[in-house]
Structures are given as C-alpha cells and as structure tokens.
C-alpha cells in the first residue's frame, strides 16, 4: 500500500505513476472538467500534499488498444 502520509515528487512520482499506470501511461495534468475551469496537476496534488492510490490512478491515461 502507498504510505499516504508522504508526498511524492520528481523521480519518485514518475516511478510510481509508471508502475501503477503501466501500459496505460500517464498525464501530469487532467483535462479541466465542465465544473472547474482549472484542474490541479499531479505535482500540486501529490508533491505539495499527500495523495493515495485512487488519486494517482486518475492520472493514468485512457487504455490504448492493441493493434
């Protein structure tokens, strides 16, 4: 389990996104929703404060399909 009391920055954040997202790949920011004009990026959410697995997974890209 990810230790939620700690923050993830730089290489630690990239490592964890790569491992968790795997073949999906990942984004550093999500597209802004209709509700919010500005979407927080993962650095703001996981480096400046702690984040959990569920939040990390929201930055995984939409699964690609095999050719």
């Amino acid at each position: 389990a990810y230790r939620p009391s700690e923050t993830l920055c730089g290489g630690e954040l990239v490592d964890t996104l790569q491992f968790v997202c795997g073949d999906r790949g990942f984004y550093f920011s999500r597209p802004a929703s209709r509700v919010s004009r500005r979407s927080r990026g993962i650095v703001e959410e996981c480096c400046f404060r702690s984040c959990d697995l569920a939040l990390l997974e929201t930055y995984c890209a939409t699964p690609a399909k095999s050719e």
Partner: antibody, heavy 118, light 106 residues
Framework: EVQLVESGGGVVQPGRSLRLSCAAS????????MTWVRQAPTKGLEWVAY????????YYRDSVKGRFTISRDNSKNTLYLQMNSLRAEDTAVYYC???????????WGQGTLVTVSS | DIVMTQSPDSLAVSLGERATINCRAS?????MHWYQQKPGQPPKLLIY???KLASGVPDRFSGSGSGTDFTLTISSLQAEDVAVYYC?????????FGQGTKVEIK
Amino acid sequence: EVQLVESGGGVVQPGRSLRLSCAASGFTFSNYYMTWVRQAPTKGLEWVAYISSGGGSTYYRDSVKGRFTISRDNSKNTLYLQMNSLRAEDTAVYYCTTEDYGYWFAYWGQGTLVTVSS
Amino acid sequence: DIVMTQSPDSLAVSLGERATINCRASSSVSYMHWYQQKPGQPPKLLIYGTSKLASGVPDRFSGSGSGTDFTLTISSLQAEDVAVYYCLQRSSYPPTFGQGTKVEIK
C-alpha cells in the same frame, strides 16, 4: 549487463521472520524502481512488492500488507524484503526484478527459496 | 484485480509443429506480455506489447490479440522451447500473471 543476485532465503518456522537481500550491478541502481515477485512451488508468478527509486513510495500485494516491508540502500546497490509473521503460503522462490517502461519485469535475479514449515 | 486465465494448462507438440497458447483477461487490457521459464531458471521476457519480440527471441515466436483474448504462437516447435509460458497484464494495478502453460515435446 544487469545483474541481480538474491540471498537470505532458507527454512523458517511459521510466525518467524526472514530478510531477503538483492545485490544489483550493471546498471544505475538508484535510477530504477524495484520489485519482488514470488513463485510458489509448482505454481505461477505473483507480484509481491514495489519500491520507487529513492525509496519514498512502496506498494504491496494485499496478502503481505502489514507483514512484509520492502526497502533499499542505494549506497550499497541493495534491495531488501523484510518478511515477518511468515505463513506456510509464503513458501516460494522470491525474485528481485526491475523493468524499463514497456519492458515490464524485464530483468530478474536467479531467485532465493523461502520455505515456511514447522 | 484482473484475473488472467491461460489455456491449456499443458500441451504436447511434435517437433516442427505449431504450438498455440491462449490467455484471457477478466477485463479488457491494453496489451499482453509473455514470459518463458525454463526449468531451474527465472522467467525471461519473450514478447512485449502483445506482438513485439524481446531482444534475441527467435521469430518463430509471435503474439496477437486484443481486448480480453490474446495468443502466443510458436510456429515450429524446437527442443529448446520446452518451458512454461506465462502471460502478464500491466494495464491495471496490480500486475497479474496467468497461471502458466507447460509446453512439452510429443
């Protein structure tokens, strides 16, 4: 050439502890996240634990959470797996592994056998 | 967790004949990855990204499939191909492997 060499396996009684080590060479260890994968006798492969390159992020499979701790010493190019409260179902060959993006679990050690038996 | 189910559990094929191994995921995945494990050795990456051969892998090995159904094919079985083959999904956390398929010579 990537080389991973595990050690520390052996026979242990249920409820006891064991610490596995994995000595890495042939690559810049501190730049790579690492994982442990295990293989029970005559069974398949099971991812066990993950640690980021600097050690700040760890993940575990549900069945070992709270009992196993993955850690690393980048100054010694060594990965560890501390296994506490061992159970018979933890009996397996434990492999130290790492990967490049897309080349998942591309590099493996030879494994170390852990037998939990009374 | 995504459950990976391989079929058959084992198969015996004559030298020079085709061997086909299937892997089904309980949910759709982006790609499938395949590993070969010979007795007394660690697994070795064989095919990544569904159909790409890892370095040094002979072209008699091929992979295909999409969604939930994937296939590993050995077009002309050689003696050195005797091994257990595993599929892996990395599209969903946690990573999960198939139970393995043992390939023997008939």
